[in-house]
Amino acid sequence: AILGRSETQECIFYNANWERDRTNRTGVEPCYGDKDKRRHCFATWKNISGSIEIVKQGCWLDDINCYDRTDCIEKKDSPEVYFCCCEGNMCNERFSYFPEMEVTQPTSNPVTPKPP
């Protein structure tokens, strides 16, 4: 491991379309990729009238947008589908929305997902 960096070897896995995609619904996903490239975890979700619906969680390939992020936080303002990525095992277990334009309180509390 590189000093000061948490390597990602596994992530929380969830797939809302597990039947269509013929995958597991929930679990832990081991992360594979080129040995010299970084690996991350991600979460995607929708906000349907204030209710959080997880779309997918899993491993994410080397992405500078995710470097050194220990927390999974979406910063884009009002996306159609929320996306966040992070580094460290299972770092996508919790995810949050803190739009970058906001300098005061976040518009939503951190989410600890409980898949339906």
């Epitope: 779309v55 390939l61 500078i64 589908v81 996306f83």
Partner: antibody
């Protein structure tokens, strides 16, 4: 092994649209971006845009804004690039590439725009 | 985002070293370690050689190396071989909040 297989060559009339596909295999499609790049005959590489394959979020080069649409179908692990209002200058080989580093490329699709 | 600037051509004899430069600005090349280098042989798709300024892609010979100084990234090929004759492009990471851009390409001729 990772593979990106693109659709075949197309000949189009000026003013029409073209839709090029890029089918991914050998990795989890929803674990990265797909980028689209074009190369006109004898010219350099030109970045067109990118899609986050899991969220569907897109970014486009300013030059192509309003004329290009990139989509992804996660059920078939396929990305699409549609370019509208074609003109002769759009004659080029169009490539898809995986991830932000463009570490794997499709074989390219020649699109010829001619009346 | 403006295109990155590369020399149109460079040449060298077998066994020699050549360096290809890629100049950007303080807001792209200068401030981020996200420049990549691609090799393209005629009629073929580009191939990633170096990513993140200096990381060699898996399977790429260690004759290829990347570096950066200020707003200029460089690709150095040492111990030049005939099969290194190709076009070389620098480019940036693209995805999320980052927009892609390529240099104009450099034709490397092995004399």
């Amino acid at each position: 092994q990772v593979q990106l297989v693109q659709s075949g060559a197309e000949v189009k009339k000026p003013g029409s649209s073209v839709k090029v596909s890029c089918k991914a295999s050998g990795y989890t499609f929803t674990s990265s971006y797909i980028n689209w790049v074009r190369q006109a005959p004898g010219q350099g590489l030109e970045w067109m845009g990118t899609i986050n394959a899991v969220s569907g979020s897109t970014s486009y080069a300013q030059k192509f804004q309003g004329r290009v649409t990139i989509t992804a179908d996660t059920s078939t692990s396929t990305a699409y690039m549609e370019l509208s209002s074609l003109r002769s200058e759009d004659t080029a080989v169009y490539y898809c590439a995986r991830g932000g580093w463009f570490d794997y490329w499709g074989q390219g699709t020649l699109v010829t725009v001619s009346s | 985002q403006s295109a990155l600037t590369q020399p149109r051509s460079v040449s060298g004899s077998p066994g020699q070293s050549v360096t290809i430069s890629c100049t950007g600005t303080s807001s792209d090349v200068g401030s981020k370690n996200y420049v990549n280098w691609y090799q393209q042989h005629p009629g073929k798709a580009p191939k990633l050689m170096i990513y993140g300024v200096s990381k060699r892609e898996s399977g790429v010979p260690d004759r290829f190396s990347g570096s950066k100084s200020g707003n200029t990234a460089s690709l150095t090929i040492s111990g030049l071989q005939a099969e290194d004759e190709a076009d070389y492009y620098c480019g940036t990471f693209a995805g999320g909040k980052y927009y892609g851009v390529f240099g104009g390409g450099t034709k490397l001729t092995v004399l």
